[in-house]
Interface confidence: medium
C-alpha cells in the first residue's frame, strides 16, 4: 500500500513539476526591467526566452519576437535547449510512469516490468528536473552578472554611451516558477525511484533444511531454492528461475551517468 502511495504521489508531483516547467518555458517574464530609481516609468519592459514585451502605463501591452541579424546568443540558445530537453524527457517519463503505476493493470504485466518502468521514469524525471534547474540558473547567473555590470556603468560614469542606454533587468516570475517546478520534478523522480524498490518481486531465499526420512539417512537440502510455494509476491511462479531474474538490490544497482553540456 505504501509503495502504491509513494508511486502515485511521485507521479502527481512530477506531473505538477513538468506542467510548471512548460509554463516557465512559455512565460515572457524571465527578466523584468529593474525599476530602482525609476518607479514612475511610463513603460515597463520584460523579456522571455522567445520574445520581448513592453507594457505601457495605459495597460497596453505589445510583445514581439526578437529582431536580430546576428542570431541569438549561445547562452540563450543553451537555456532554450535545456528547458526543451527537460520538457521532452519529462513528457516521456510521464508516459512511461502511467503504464508503470501499480494501480493500473495492463494485461499480464508483471511487477518486475512495472518496477523497471518506474525506475526508468524516475530517472527521466530527475534528469528533467535537473535540466530545468540548470537552465533557469544559467539565465539567472547571466542576469546577476549583467545587473552588477550595469550598476557599475551607471555609477562610475564608465562605458560612455552604455551609461545612458543600458536597461537593468532583474529576476522575473518565470525563474521562480522554473526553480520550483524543476525541484518538484526532481522530488517526484526520487519518489518514483524509491517506489521502484518496493515494486521489485520479493524473492526469498529459504535456508537449507534437513529432512530425515524414516529408516534412511538421506539428507535433502534444497538450499538456494527460490520460493515457489505461493508465498510472497510471485504467486504465478513465472520466470523465477530465469537467469535474468534480479533481486531487490540488483534492480537498484544500475549505474546511470548523465553528462550535462
Amino acid at each position: 500500500m505504501a509503495v502504491t502511495a509513494c508511486q502515485g504521489l511521485g507521479f502527481v508531483v512530477s506531473l505538477i513539476g513538468i506542467a510548471g516547467i512548460i509554463a516557465a518555458t512559455c512565460m515572457d517574464q524571465w527578466s523584468t526591467q529593474d525599476l530602482y530609481n525609476n518607479p514612475v516609468t511610463a513603460v515597463f519592459n520584460y523579456q522571455g526566452l522567445w520574445r520581448s514585451c513592453v507594457r505601457e502605463s495605459s495597460g497596453f501591452t505589445e510583445c514581439r519576437g526578437y529582431f536580430t541579424l546576428l542570431g541569438l546568443p549561445a547562452m540563450l540558445q543553451a537555456v532554450r535547449a535545456l528547458m526543451i530537453v527537460g520538457i521532452v524527457l519529462g513528457a516521456i517519463g510521464l508516459l512511461v510512469s502511467i503504464f508503470a503505476l501499480k494501480c493500473i493493470r495492463i494485461g499480464s504485466m508483471e511487477d518486475s516490468a512495472k518496477a523497471n518502468m518506474t525506475l526508468t521514469s524516475g530517472i527521466m524525471f530527475i534528469v528533467s528536473g535537473l535540466c530545468a534547474i540548470a537552465g533557469v540558473s544559467v539565465f539567472a547567473n547571466m542576469l546577476v552578472t549583467n545587473f552588477w555590470m550595469s550598476t557599475a556603468n551607471m555609477y562610475t560614469g564608465m562605458g560612455g554611451m552604455v551609461q545612458t542606454v543600458q536597461t537593468r533587468y532583474t529576476f522575473g516570475a518565470a525563474l521562480f516558477v522554473g526553480w520550483v517546478a524543476g525541484g518538484l520534478t526532481l522530488i517526484g523522480g526520487v519518489m518514483m525511484c524509491i517506489a521502484c524498490r518496493g515494486l521489485a518481486p520479493e524473492e526469498t531465499n529459504y535456508k537449507a533444511v534437513s529432512y530425515h526420512a524414516s529408516g534412511h539417512s538421506v539428507a535433502y537440502k534444497p538450499g538456494g531454492f527460490k520460493a515457489s510455494t505461493g508465498f510472497g509476491s510471485n504467486t504465478k511462479n513465472k520466470k523465477i528461475y530465469d537467469g535474468g531474474a534480479r533481486t531487490e538490490d540488483e534492480v537498484q544497482s544500475y549505474p546511470s551517468k548523465h553528462d550535462y553540456v
Epitope: 527578466s31 523579456q47 520581448s52 526578437y66 529582431f67 536580430t68 541579424l69 546576428l70 541569438l72 546568443p73 547562452m75 540563450l76 537555456v79 539565465f139 547571466m142 542576469l143 552578472t145 549583467n146 555590470m149 560612455g160 554611451m161 552604455v162 545612458t164 542606454v165 543600458q166 536597461t167 533587468y169
Partner: nanobody, 119 residues
Framework: QVQLVESGGGLVQPGGSLRLSCAAS???????MAWYRQAPGKQRELVAG???????NYADSVKGRFTISRDFAKNTVDLQMNSLKPEDTAVYYC??????????????WGQGTLVTVSS
Amino acid sequence: QVQLVESGGGLVQPGGSLRLSCAASGEISSDAMAWYRQAPGKQRELVAGMTRGGSTNYADSVKGRFTISRDFAKNTVDLQMNSLKPEDTAVYYCNAEIYTGTFYPRSYWGQGTLVTVSS
C-alpha cells in the same frame, strides 16, 4: 543619448532610384545595422542588414534591387534602392543592434523616413 537619424526619403517614380542614409550620433559601435520598413497597416519587416563581420541579409522582395553599405569610421549605414516599385512605399526605419553583455541585443531605432513610389 544615442540617436539614429535617417535622411534621403521622398517621392520617386516607379523604376526610379533613391539612396537612404542613416547616421548614428554618440559613441555607438554597433554590432549590426539594418533598414526596416513598415507599410500602412502592415508589420515592420527587415529590408536589409549588415553585421560587423560584413555579412548581409536581404528580404526576398528586394534582392537584386537594394544594396546596403556601411561606413564604420563615420558610423553610417546607407541603403541604395534601385528599380523601385509602388509596393516599396513605406516608412523606412534605421536600426542598430548592440550587445552589452545580456542575452538580448540592445536595439535602437530612428524616427523613420517616408519613401513614396508613385507615378
